[in-house]
């Protein structure tokens, strides 16, 4: 997958919706300049392509939704990379521009005669891409041409700004909410001193900024904050891990506002450096409950607490997807490449893969083996349905009493479509209400996951809580088998009775040394000792002073002991 030739998946229709999915991993650092993408992806790639194709089939066969109008699509690969996604978005735009010029009769042949050639239909809207950084770049281009964009996993807070990203909407909440959820978890377990890591790029940067702001307000200190690219080399991850280690044993919790592949990079570095079990990772929804993050590095991931957008599996998608086979699935141009990669075998008639795999694919192979549905599948499908309902409402309003596309919808006006989309509300694939606020955002509901060793060499994610509209619920007994097992992540222990906190110059407020008050002093507040007034003495609990009772000497009392100044 280099920049020379890009594969596209097409499905014909009266209205064409564009989609950007990360069919392949992002280019590695050394391949970025040539935009050569990495290996094919199943959950984030192939499953999403198939979800688009099959969801459109379902919509097209639903007599109540867009009757007499067929939705088609053009799916392109973003490779989770801005440069690739922009290149692909330009292709969407180019199709739209040529089509609109045709509508206005501007396309003429070289000899001056008019053309009978029909180019592709324009893209009315775009679904995706997954990454916030990439979505921002794509939106910057799409909004110039009034093309609405509906994202299914780009959660950056920046995208809520409608002055900057007018044509952007999403079926997921803004990251401000999961940053709050992460802070609430940190607070719950009295972790007052944590390290912070984020993925370079908009998702990680804005999310971590929110996490740090909220932490400061709650009296949580950040030992140090680090950033790294998901595709950074081993050496960069090793260096980052060493830096995190320098904050042990105080900052055992590492809050990671990270993409899944950043977390994987950290886990791999933990293995290399012999640091399994030294940290507790608190991960954002980039990690969620993804097995491609932890596979092969489960020991390093054990104990991890992650945030996952609430989205149950979609059963009807599995019913469709698990029956797919390479010999019959020709509409997905990446499917054969994926099949070979998934089963590490060679399909007959695909010479480009010959060098990679020696064994031929067995005909008994099935996707049912080790199948895991993409954790964001529900959002992908909801995004597609949002576009369909938006178009449906627009058709009802512009073409009353007319089944199909009336002239008022030819060509589709992106401004009117955006208006219609913003007003859309419907019951989503999981039974929840899908609606958009004035920023084009959806409400936030999260599940809290915990990665655990369930048995000998068997690891899994379990649901240990939820965060819904500001309320955190956690099953503490499920996370920690005993109260004493709760990990401590504090810089300094509380001071003993009669001691005050002395914060060293340049240190954060969570780090102090405990100093006892002098003999004649009491603890005025946690940072100050104060001397008792003449004639009074500190109380036993050192919280104040009591008057010293005056004792008068009488004849016959033993003489008092005197101490020289030299006596200590």
């Amino acid at each position: 997958q280099s920049s020379e030739r890009r594969v596209v998946a097409h499905m014909p229709g009266d209205i064409i919706i564009g989609a950007l999915f990360s069919v392949h991993h992002q280019p590695t650092v050394d391949k970025v300049h040539e935009r050569k993408c990495g290996a094919v992806r199943e959950q984030y790639g192939i499953q999403r392509v198939e979800a688009m194709l099959h969801t459109l089939e379902r919509i097209n066969s639903d007599p109540t939704l867009l009757p007499n109008i067929t939705l088609g699509c053009e799916i392109r690969d973003s490779c989770w990379h801005s440069a690739v996604a922009l290149e692909q978005s330009i292709e969407f735009i180019r199709d739209s521009l040529i089509s609109s010029e045709e509508e206005e009769g501007l396309v003429r042949c070289v000899d001056g005669s008019s053309s009978s050639f029909r180019s592709k239909k324009p893209i009315v809207g775009v679904i995706g891409p997954g990454s916030s950084s990439v979505a921002i770049q794509v939106q910057n281009l799409l909004q110039l041409f009034n093309i609405p964009q509906i994202a299914y996993s780009a959660t950056s807070m920046d995208l809520s700004d409608k002055t900057l990203f007018k044509y952007f909407m999403r079926v997921v909440p803004s990251d401000a909410q999961q940053a709050r959820a992460m802070v609430d978890i940190v607070k719950r377990y009295n972790w007052t001193y944590v390290s912070a890591v984020h993925t370079e790029g908009n998702y990680g940067e804005s999310g971590m900024e929110a996490f740090k702001d909220m932490s400061a307000k709650e009296g949580i200190c950040i030992a140090h904050s680090y950033k790294i690219y998901s595709n950074a080399g081993e050496q960069s991850f090793d260096k980052l891990l060493k830096k995190l280690t320098s904050h042990l044993p105080k900052a055992r919790v590492v809050a990671c506002f990270c993409e899944g592949m950043t977390v994987r990079g950290l886990l791999m570095a933990m293995r290399r450096l012999g640091l399994a079990g030294e940290f507790l990772l608190l991960g954002s929804d980039g990690w969620a409950d993804r097995y491609d993050v932890t596979d092969g590095y489960q020991r390093e991931a054990v104990g991890g607490i992650t945030i996952k957008l609430q989205s149950p599996d979609v059963k009807w998608f599995d019913d469709y997807y698990l029956k797919l086979r390479p010999e019959t699935n020709h509409r997905n141009p990446w499917f054969q490449e994926f099949w070979q990669h998934r089963f590490q075998c060679r399909l007959e008639g695909f010479p480009q893969e010959n060098s990679k795999y020696n064994k031929t694919c067995d005909s008994s192979l099935t996707l049912k083996t080790h199948h895991v549905q993409d954790s964001k599948m529900g959002f992908v499908i909801n995004a597609i349905y949002s576009m369909a309902y938006g178009l449906h409402n627009m058709q009802m309003s512009l073409c009353p009493g007319y089944a199909g596309l009336c002239d008022a919808m030819k060509p589709i006006d992106g401004r009117k479509l955006l208006e219609s989309l913003m007003k859309t509300n419907f019951t989503g694939v999981s039974g929840d209400m899908i609606l958009f606020d004035e920023n084009g955002d959806s409400p936030g509901r999260y599940e809290i996951m915990n990665f655990k060793e369930m048995g000998k060499d068997y690891f899994d994610y379990i649901n240990v809580g939820s965060w819904d509209n500001g309320e955190l619920k956690m099953d503490d007994d499920e996370v920690w088998s005993k109260k004493s097992n709760i990990i401590r992540s504090v810089c300094s222990e509380p001071c003993e009775k009669g001691q005050i906190k002395v914060i060293r110059k340049g240190e954060v407020s969570c780090c102090w040394t405990c100093t006892p008050c002098k003999e004649n002093e009491y603890v005025f507040d946690e940072y100050t000792c104060k001397a008792c007034q003449l004639g009074s003495w500190p109380t036993d609990d050192l919280t104040g002073c009591d008057l010293i009772p005056v004792q008068y000497l009488r004849w016959g009392d033993p003489e008092p002991d005197y101490k020289d100044d030299d006596d200590k």
């Epitope: 081993e234 050496q235 891990l241 060493k242 280690t245 044993p249 012999g274 030294e278």
Partner: antibody
């Protein structure tokens, strides 16, 4: 801040032996501790490490025969199935960080273990 | 397994001369190489950490350099007190290794 090894003595092959490293002036929660040995006239040979958290790693040749453990002020090295090849001065050394292997800033004087029949 | 190969095993140097000791790691250890000096009957003493940083109280005639897999300890203006055995040590990982130290280099000062 100091570390001091003890427990080295003359033993016969096959006898188990436990060495102790006593530390003062710092907390074992904050530093990893290493065991290193040196046979007479030979180079330094790393045996293993115990982190502040209690996690342990051993040299591949030492796995199964050597076990490190700790209390609040001591680190023990339990040795089993000793042979004459295990005759050496055993050092305890403090690592710079609480976990991972880094560099050794504080060494004990060593304790001599002699295995002979 | 990660192995540290140290050369030479022994070197003779005149007072005031320069001695160079090399250490090669079998894999990239970034800059996590330390150097120790050990005199007879004494425990080793840290000279250099993180490839080039001088440990506290160590004279500036000791210099560490290198990164990745190749590391060097250079002693310039050698003094009689520098007669000792020098060891390199990887500070990369304790996992799956036979030894974190190199084989040692004996420096004889004439």
């Amino acid at each position: 801040q100091s570390v001091e090894e003890s427990g080295g003595r003359l033993v016969t092959p096959g006898t188990p032996l436990t060495l102790t490293c006593t530390v003062s002036g710092f907390s074992l929660n904050n530093y990893a501790m290493n065991w290193i040995r040196q046979a007479p006239g030979k180079g330094l040979e790393w045996i293993g490490i115990i982190y502040g958290s209690g996690s342990t790693y051993y040299a591949s040749w030492a796995k199964g025969r050597f076990t490190a453990s700790k209390t609040s002020t001591t680190v023990d090295l339990k040795m089993t199935s000793l042979t004459t090849e295990d005759t050496a001065t055993y050092f305890c050394a403090r690592d710079e960080l609480a976990a991972g292997i880094n560099y050794f800033t504080l060494w004990g004087q060593g304790t001599l273990v002699t295995v002979s029949s | 397994a990660l192995v540290m190969t140290q050369t030479p095993a022994s070197v003779e140097v005149a007072v005031g001369g320069t001695v160079t000791i090399k250490c090669q790691a079998s894999q990239n250890i970034i800059d996590w190489c330390s150097w120790y000096q050990q005199k007879l009957g004494q425990p080793p003493k840290l000279l250099i950490y993180e490839a080039s940083k001088l440990a506290s109280g160590v004279p500036s005639r000791f210099k560490g350099s290198g990164s990745g897999t190749q590391f060097t300890l250079t002693i310039s203006g050698v003094e009689c007190a520098d007669a000792a055995t020098y060891y390199c040590q990887q500070g990369y990982s304790p996992s799956g290794v036979d030894n974190v130290f190199g084989g040692g280099t004996e420096v004889v000062v004439k």
